[in-house]
Amino acid sequence: AYRPSETLCGGELVDTLQFVCGDRGFYFSRPASRVSRRSRGIVEECCFRSCDLALLETYCATPAKSE
């Protein structure tokens, strides 16, 4: 489970995004493909610094549907 306001790097960052975004998906492409400006951003913000749940959610592919 996600622990707020911590450094997330590598596979832990990928897995946490999968958990947070669920079926929505997120702004990562496949390994070895060209790194996008967006994906560089999340590593900068969550691995090189610490990030919280709200910031992680901004990288989900589409907004969560409101009930």
């Epitope: 590598g10 596979g11 990928v14 897995d15 390994p31 493909s33 790194v35 560089r40 590593v43």
Partner: antibody, heavy 120, light 107 residues
Amino acid sequence: QVQLVQSGAEVKKPGASVKVSCKASGYTFTSYYMHWVRQAPGQGLEWMGIINPSGGSTSYAQKFQGRVTMTRDTSTSTVYMELSRLRSDDTAVYYCARDVQWLAYGMDVWGQGTTVTVSS
Amino acid sequence: RIQMTQSPSPLSASVGDRVTITCRASQSISSYLNWYQQKPGKAPKLLIYAASSLQSGVPSRFSGSGSGTDFTLTISSLQPEDFATYYCQQSYSTPLTFGGGTKVEIK
């Protein structure tokens, strides 16, 4: 072809600093993070940290925090690793290595290594 | 900090042998495990990433498996050029850490 070419061997005295360079070619320099890894004689591999060549941001292993500085020059597609306050146990081969993606899938291209010897 | 432990070391084998090297993580790292080959005086070479994905250009006799804490690198039929030291590396969290290495020697 994709390659990383590092600077030559260095001999330093304890307390001094060393700056190792790593010049990238054959790919878009700013699209891949760069790691630094070292290997003491007859020992295993030790991760030192990583730099984003695009913005220059860095993340260092706690062990080296305060002693290591990683920088880059986008005009020459070169990254640098400077280690200060050298000790005899810093004697090692220092490698730069390209990150595959997001620190999650390994290091796919390595420099040839730079031998740093620290001796009085 | 995640500790990586490799075994056996060293490993004696002959050309044509099936060789298995194991790597254990001190906590679960999902499938974020990479394998490298290093020959004396040379830089490491990435063989396997994400536990089981073969890096481009690496011969198919190399394979990887495992998830969680236990992983294996298998060489199905050892070739003369495969005598080297092999390292596992976790890429689940920083600091990235490597196993101590397994040297594959000629029997």
